[in-house]
């Protein structure tokens, strides 16, 4: 297993609709053609997997049907979007990149993106 540098933004604020997007960029040491990207969430010293996708360079990222993530790739960049976020989902979202093929296998883990989620204030009832 060889190490690889992964860069991602330090902080992102989710939209009022609970959507957060960030770019995960990796410094590919070789000509990788198959890449696996995993988003991990770290909160209270616990790490959980949010979503993951394996894709062939040039092809779209396809997450599982029940995934809260979508994404696109361009060169050594992956544009990730996480949906359905609520205030309780605030935390550090870490991008993990694995170069699966061809060998050798490379692994890179970013420092994480702190995503802040603020639940919108409920609209007051109004009489018309």
């Amino acid at each position: 297993c060889k190490a690889m540098h992964v860069a991602q933004p330090a902080v992102v604020l989710a939209s009022s609709r609970g959507i957060a997007s960030f770019v995960c960029e990796y410094a590919s040491p070789g000509k990788a053609t198959e890449v696996r990207v995993t988003v991990l969430r770290q909160a209270d010293s616990q790490v959980t997997e949010v979503c993951a996708a394996t894709y062939m360079m040039g092809n779209e990222l396809t997450f599982l049907d029940d995934s809260i993530c979508t994404g696109t790739s361009s060169g050594n960049q992956v544009n990730l979007t996480i949906q359905g976020l609520r205030a309780m989902d605030t935390g550090l979202y870490i991008c993990k990149v694995e170069l699966m093929y061809p060998p050798p296998y490379y692994l890179g883990i970013g420092n994480g993106t702190q995503i802040y989620v603020i639940d919108p204030e409920p609209c007051p009832d109004s009489d018309f």
Epitope: T33, E34, R36, T38, C51, A52, A53, T54, Y55, M56, G58, N59, T62, F63, L64, S67, M100, Y101, P102, P103, Y105
Partner: antibody
Framework: QVQLVQSGAEVKKPGASVKVSCEAS????????IHWLRQAPGQGLEWMGI????????TYAQKFQGRITMTRDTSTNTLYMELSSLRSEDTAIYYC??????????????WGQGTTVTVSS | DIVMTQSPSSLSASVGDRVTITCRAS??????LNWYQQKPGKAPKLLIY???SLQSGVPPRFSGSGSGTEFTLTISSLQPEDFATYYC?????????FGQGTKVDIK
Amino acid sequence: QVQLVQSGAEVKKPGASVKVSCEASGYTFTNYYIHWLRQAPGQGLEWMGIINPSGGSTTYAQKFQGRITMTRDTSTNTLYMELSSLRSEDTAIYYCARRDCRGPSCYFAYWGQGTTVTVSS
Amino acid sequence: DIVMTQSPSSLSASVGDRVTITCRASQSISSYLNWYQQKPGKAPKLLIYAASSLQSGVPPRFSGSGSGTEFTLTISSLQPEDFATYYCQQANSFPPTFGQGTKVDIK
């Protein structure tokens, strides 16, 4: 729809070579890896190697290094697997299969119908 | 290479039975496991990918579970067309490797 159509059965003598073809249709040829696998009579599935149709790069299983060659022809969307120095234990059904990925996992979603290769003196 | 071991290697069952097949990996493969069904003279057919996701068109009586090193394929109510050989395959690392197969035949 996606289809992988393989060439017909072959009977070869020990020491000879065999070249199996796999014609792909119904998708963008260069967008998916093709793997070759084989299955000896009554046995399980054995992975032989992979080819990237986009650039033609290959990786072979250690067991077959030196006597296997995978190639592709992008003008006809056809892949080839040639195995040389055949011996009786190479008698098997040879499959081409397309590798697809969904979520984190990749799998063989589409297979050729198989090509039976018999090695006998 | 990761070694995949299936058990049992064969089993006899009746229509309507609940059948469970186990697959073990020689090291952790997270949830990167696929299951295939193969009938005599035919190519394998993908049933389940990513340990528990049902491939499109596969009947819901098939289900998969597990993570790490131990996985199971369950057929909730065996049908006549389910008598076949089943293979697990790891997709965690290169190269892909298969279990030796489990043959399900009629009791």
